[in-house]
Amino acid sequence: TLNSVLNSNAIKNLPPPLGGAAGHPGSAVSAAPGILYPGGNKYQTIDNYQPYPCAEDEECGTDEYCASPTRGGDAGVQICLACRKRRKRCMRHAMCCPGNYCKNGICVSSDQNHFRGEIEETITESFGNDHSTLDGYSRRTTLSSKMYHTKGQEGSVCLRSSDCASGLCCARHFWSKICKPVLKEGQVCTKHRRKGSHGLEIFQRCYCGEGLSCRIQKDHHQASNSSRLHTCQRH
């Protein structure tokens, strides 16, 4: 069963600092044996990965979406699955890898002016409407007056980073912008290859915190340009 996979791949002897206790996320490094991990149409072995149960796409990482690992998807446990690359089949945008979106059941590049226009247009519309959605978590939930009172906290709607509390920045999440945590050391960051490319991001990340810069991760230097992982590192 899926659960035997979940349990047999539990991380052994996890030291406390990695654990994200006291409300802080831990290290981005996972130390589990290689397991079968669905990606595209084939199962591939990914080292150092543990299945991650989820209820929503937004709980998963940027390169993942939330779904049942079995075809047909029963009502059992869902896990974060590897995002679908270009030209792979999809049912919703979140299934496609960053830089792509789901069109007519296929992941296609979002590096097209008309799609970028659609995103910008929708964001503009959402801020001119009292019933705009809060973020990816509440696309199906309208804003209540209570949410406006928590303005500036994580998850609050914003227009610019100055609308957010200390330690947060204003970043895109689906079709609106919300306050998200400024990135800490070791967290994955986005390095924009060309000016203006951030306009294509549906899940925008904050910038790196003070004293940190977004640089290529040392052990990823050998990777191809497109798959290089950038993390927030000390200057």
Epitope: G20, S27, A28, Y52, A55, G61, Y137, S138, G155, P181
Partner: nanobody
Framework: EVQLVESGGGLVQPGGSLRLSCAAS????????LKWVRQAPGKGLEWVSH????????MYADSVKGRFTISRDNAKNMLYLQMNSLKPEDTAVYFC?????????????????RGQGTQVTVSS
Amino acid sequence: EVQLVESGGGLVQPGGSLRLSCAASGFPFSIYPLKWVRQAPGKGLEWVSHISRDGGRTMYADSVKGRFTISRDNAKNMLYLQMNSLKPEDTAVYFCARSAGKVVSRASLENDYRGQGTQVTVSS
């Protein structure tokens, strides 16, 4: 700052019950799915149960299915875990947790926001 504070743990005999609570603050509670994870002595983190934003969907690990019930009260910013028919193998530190979400490329249990945990010991 995200804060999660668990309570309700303790020593209980096999077959007994406990109800864990988790008080959350520092984030808009009702828009996040939440979960319980546990860590037995000398073992890694193990996912226990999950609940959707509105509480309408729940998921459980096979090892606790039919014995544990997860619930939430969005008005009070509280998450709960009702544990019945407890077994010695349920002995662990229990954490309530929230995903770190889209700030990582791949999600993992150790990336989650979670509290300090509450100890549950099942022994006769």
